[in-house]
């Protein structure tokens, strides 16, 4: 961690992303410790705060205004040197959010990924942002940064993310900088979701009463494994949400969940995937795909589940 | 949205001990601190300290030296305000409010009232 | 420690005027002033900080300025849910102090 021998190192807790209003815990980490410190910041606004003043373990930032976005640096206490203090630490950048409005977030080709594929995410906004910042749920580091390229009063970046490995699965917030401001960043984009699919053994996927059925019979689609999945996903073919349920184990030590879509209309292609607590936007394979007929007078479409939308939560635990 | 709610009122006798509790939500407990103030029955505001929520090292004003000690439990979220010997002028409504180094306090609890009276 | 004085200790205006509290520190406190209200029965509700930074939700006929060692709220248009105690409080040094209070009150 250290920079060196007498350089202490600055890092931020949760993030170096922070919310206008929001709070953040600053450490100084210096010979193998937490120490007494000193804090600056490099422009030298918004420091009256800092005067004189010693700091024990970490310093609480907050509630954030634009004027703390900047690069901040400690010095360790070191009482018996000429000054008393070290080296200044590493930079550390603090982005303060919600100083624009927020730009837009898309996935190419899509947010259901398998592992090894790469991902286009598309920022884009018409505000015409300098920076764009591609940022992960739950990281400390900072975020990716890209020029913003304007075209036809747009101006957009897009954040090439790959080969996909379980790490890289979660959920993704873009913001937008203007110039001479790089570090006050808009309000976040929409969360997307990035999920990662084929890491587990498929489960297996069936319909009760049938795959064939009367219209206006009631369907239940069932998805189970002998892998002990916490949660299972159903999506259906063309369509933008995906349904998810919490899988109960069965007397026969398979893990199951009983998706009811209510009673058939129109039939469809489907599919699950299985998923654990600890990594919800890490799913199995797909299950083999499940085709629903529907025979007699379809009326209208089935209020049905499908393919993950960036909307839907599902890098959030099931509660 | 942040939410602190606070144990109930308290009715002590001089020389006993009371144990304000106060439980944050809405927000990450461990990146913020939690600040206490007195407001004694006739008087203003009066910053008693604070406890660094991440660290978990407390700072107490001059005269809330000795007999207040802050403490936090993280794994429930909750920061608590101990009075050991207590006095009649520690009669006072006590309030948590969350803040940091920085001393601004963002959202407060209700309030606990505690009687010292014989 | 910094002494803040408020005043006035109490004010009464009709609903529609424009109110000003002053709060002056005994020393610089280079605008690290919060104000916060605090209405009968319920806990003080932060409005400003930094001077000059209005808190969440907080109406924008609420507005504070100063430097220095002399700060001002001003409520553009007094209406009446603003009936409180009002105080200003220094977070540029330890121990964090706070003014008296004022109490406005509408006639």
């Known amino acids: 961690l250290m920079g060196g021998q007498d350089k202490p190192f600055l890092s931020a807790r949760p993030s170096t992303v922070v919310p206008r209003g929001g709070h953040v815990a600053l450490q100084c980490h210096y010979r193998r410790g937490f120490n007494n410190f000193m804090l600056y910041k490099e422009d030298r606004s918004h420091v009256p705060i800092f005067h004189g003043r010693i700091f024990q373990e970490s310093f609480i930032m907050g509630p954030v205004t634009p004027a703390h976005a900047g690069t901040y640096r400690c010095r360790g206490s070191r009482p018996h040197s000429l000054t008393g203090w070290s080296a200044p630490s590493n930079p550390l950048v603090i982005m303060v959010t919600g100083n624009h409005r927020k730009p837009s977030l898309l996935a190419h080709p899509g947010p259901l990924l398998k592992s090894g594929e790469t991902v286009i995410l598309q920022c884009w906004s018409d505000v015409m942002f300098e920076h764009f910042f591609l940022h992960r749920e739950g990281i400390s580091e900072d975020p990716s940064r890209l020029v913003g390229q304007i075209h036809d009063g747009v101006s957009k970046a897009n954040f090439s993310i790959g080969p996909l490995m379980p790490v890289l699965a979660g959920t993704y917030r873009c913001y937008g900088s203007v110039p001479h401001s790089p570090y006050q960043l808009s309000a976040p984009s929409d969360p997307l979701d990035i999920v990662i699919t084929g890491l587990y053994e498929k489960p297996s996927l069936s319909a009760q009463p049938g795959p064939t059925v009367q219209a206006g019979e009631n369907v239940t689609l069932s998805c189970s494994s002998w892998s002990s999945y916490d949660i299972y996903h159903l999506s259906r073919e063309g369509e933008a949400h995906e349904r998810r349920l919490r899988a109960v184990p069965k007397v026969n030590r398979t893990f199951q969940a009983d998706f009811p879509l209510g009673p058939a209309t129109h039939g469809g292609t489907y599919r699950c995937f299985g998923s654990f607590r600890a990594l919800p936007c890490v799913w199995s394979n797909s299950s083999d795909p499940l085709l629903v007929s529907v025979t007699g007078n379809p009326s209208s479409s089935w209020p049905s589940p499908t393919e993950p939308s960036s909307k839907s939560g599902i890098c959030r635990h099931l509660h | 949205q942040v939410q602190l709610v606070q144990s109930g009122s308290e009715l002590k006798k001089p020389g006993a001990s009371v144990k304000v509790s106060c439980k944050a939500s809405g927000y990450t407990f461990t990146t913020a601190g939690m600040q206490w103030v007195q407001k004694s029955p006739g008087q203003g505001l009066e910053w008693m300290g604070w406890?660094?929520?991440?660290?978990?090292?407390?700072k107490y004003a001059e005269d809330f030296k000795g007999r207040f000690v802050f403490s936090l439990d993280t794994s429930v979220s909750t920061a608590y305000l101990q009075i050991s010997s207590l006095k009649a002028e520690d009669t006072a409504v006590y309030f948590c409010?969350?803040?940091?180094?920085?001393?601004?306090?963002?959202?407060w609890g209700q309030g606990t009232t505690v009687t010292v009276s014989s | 420690d910094i002494q803040m004085t408020q005043s006035p200790s109490f004010l009464s205006a009709s609903v529609g005027d424009r109110v000003t509290i002053t709060c002056k520190a005994s020393?610089?406190?280079?605008?690290?002033v919060a104000w916060y209200q605090q209405k009968p029965g319920q806990p003080p509700k932060l409005l400003i900080y930094?001077?000059?930074t209005r808190h969440t939700g907080v109406p924008d006929r609420f507005s504070g300025s100063g430097s220095g060692t002399d700060y001002t709220l001003t409520i553009s248009s007094l209406q009446a849910e603003d009936v409180a105690v009002y105080y200003c409080q220094q977070h540029y040094s330890t121990p964090w102090t706070f003014g008296g209070g004022t109490k406005v009150e509408i006639k």
């Open positions: 409010a969350r803040g940091g180094d920085e001393g601004v306090m963002d959202y």
């Open positions: 930094w001077t000059s």
């Open positions: 406890i660094n929520s991440h660290s978990g090292v407390p």
């Open positions: 020393q610089d406190v280079s605008t690290a």
